[in-house]
């Protein structure tokens, strides 16, 4: 079994999250992709999921969340914005391939979002934000649920890295349709 | 423990062509994106290609484009970089390095290896 | 292409001191910047990256702060090995990844 891998980011609130997930271009460039967060004990949980088939450099926004699949690149872009510290936990990118399982990409991301000015003198991510003004156009797409009967109902242990997740739900602001979505290694 | 160990190196004429190779051990290395990252005598960090993991996709700086070819075998475990049209500005340490999984940054790298375009 | 600007070139100071080094983003890179250390004859090292977080094995005497357009990189207190070029990097977007010029920092 391939070893699972986390990279870490230690963000302040308000900051974002801008990480990019790697896939084979051939194999996945239509596919439809979604990004989860996976709480101790629970199964995968969908935040957002691109459309299906996946539109070339189409921003989907859920909430503070935004996907962008560069089909020409073979990368999903994943931006989470204005970054709370409800928001620190784990997540990884999948590829939904039905009827097959989904595929997950590597690594996952450890976030910790911490309170506390995040700038230096001069320094303002608000004046940049019109990057995240996402045009009237943009659709959220509905993320479908799989069924299997190798369900997963424990998530992975926790880093041995000097980060811990919080317990507390996260609390993404107009999220919604958030499914639960089993995902195999 | 990741190790990057970049070969190849040496003095070429200019017009004159070199292959580098980095070898790499201790992690996946089809997962993840590769970048050649050269340093002039006495001179800064200059990024020059990139090759992506999983969907091979390749970058290469404005300086380089078309003359140099970034190429990688799984199988093997290692990068290359083909320099053709040497030019005496081509003259630097070369290093290879590995990126992160979700971002092009550079969490590990080769020892380098100097190229000299001279006549 | 993203240009990025490091002040100062060279900064002088004394071990236990503190140390703080700037760069600066032709356009807004968020929060997508590293840092890097790099010793005579060696390769460079890892510091920051994410503008703020400590890559693995690095003192906490390093921290990055900053997001946008203007970051900064504080040792907080010197140590002998912490003299070195210390280099900023941009991964915002898409290719070229930039490079600041480099700052030197050298014993005062």
């Known amino acids: 079994a391939t070893k699972l891998t986390e990279e870490k980011y230690e963000l302040k609130e308000g900051q974002t999250l801008d990480v990019k997930c790697d896939y084979t271009l051939e194999k996945f460039a239509s596919s439809q992709k979604a990004w989860q967060i996976i709480r101790d004990g629970e199964m995968p949980k969908t935040l957002a999921c691109t459309e299906r088939p996946s539109k070339n450099s189409h921003p989907v926004q859920v909430g503070r969340i935004i996907l962008e699949d560069y089909h020409d690149h073979g990368l999903l872009r994943v931006r989470m914005v204005n970054l709370q510290v409800e928001d620190s936990g784990l997540y990884q990118c999948v590829i939904y391939q039905p009827p097959k399982e989904p595929h997950m990409l590597f690594d996952r991301i450890r976030l910790v979002v911490t309170k506390g000015f995040s700038g230096t003198p001069g320094s303002n991510e608000n004046s940049t934000q019109n990057v995240y003004k996402i045009p009237p156009t943009t659709t959220k797409a509905l993320c479908p649920l799989y069924t299997s009967p190798r369900t997963v109902t424990q998530a992975p242990p926790k880093s041995t890295a000097d980060v811990s997740t919080p317990d507390s739900e996260i609390n993404l602001t107009n999220v919604t349709d958030i499914i639960r979505v089993p995902v195999f290694n | 423990e990741v190790q990057l160990l970049e070969s190849g190196g040496g003095l070429v004429q200019p017009g004159g062509s070199l292959r580098l190779s980095c070898a790499v051990s201790?992690?996946?290395?089809?997962?993840?994106?590769m970048s050649w990252v050269r340093q002039a005598p006495g001179k800064g960090l200059e990024w020059v290609s990139e090759m992506r993991g999983s969907s091979g996709s390749t970058y290469y700086a404005d300086s380089v484009k078309g003359r140099f070819t970034i190429s990688r075998d799984n199988s093997k475990n290692t990068l290359y970089l083909q320099m053709n049209s040497l030019r005496v500005e081509d003259t630097a340490i070369y290093y290879c390095?590995?990126?992160?999984?979700?971002?092009?940054?550079?969490?590990?790298w080769g020892q380098g290896t100097l190229v000299t375009v001279s006549s | 292409e993203i240009v990025m600007t490091q002040s100062p070139a060279t900064l002088s100071v004394s071990p236990g001191e503190r140390a703080t080094l700037s760069c600066r983003a032709s356009?807004?890179?968020?929060?997508?910047l590293a840092w890097y250390q790099q010793k005579p004859g060696q390769a460079p090292r890892l510091l920051i990256y994410g503008a703020s977080t400590r890559a693995t094995g690095i003192p906490a005497r390093f921290s990055g702060s900053g997001s946008g357009t203007e970051f900064t990189l504080t040792i907080s207190s010197l140590q002998s090995e912490d003299f070195a070029v210390y280099y900023c990097q941009q991964f915002y977007n898409w290719p070229p990844w930039t490079f600041g010029q480099g700052t030197k920092v050298e014993i005062k």
């Open positions: 356009q807004s890179v968020n929060s997508n």
């Open positions: 390095a590995k990126e992160f999984s979700s971002n092009s940054l550079f969490d590990y």
């Open positions: 201790g992690f996946t290395f089809s997962r993840y994106a």
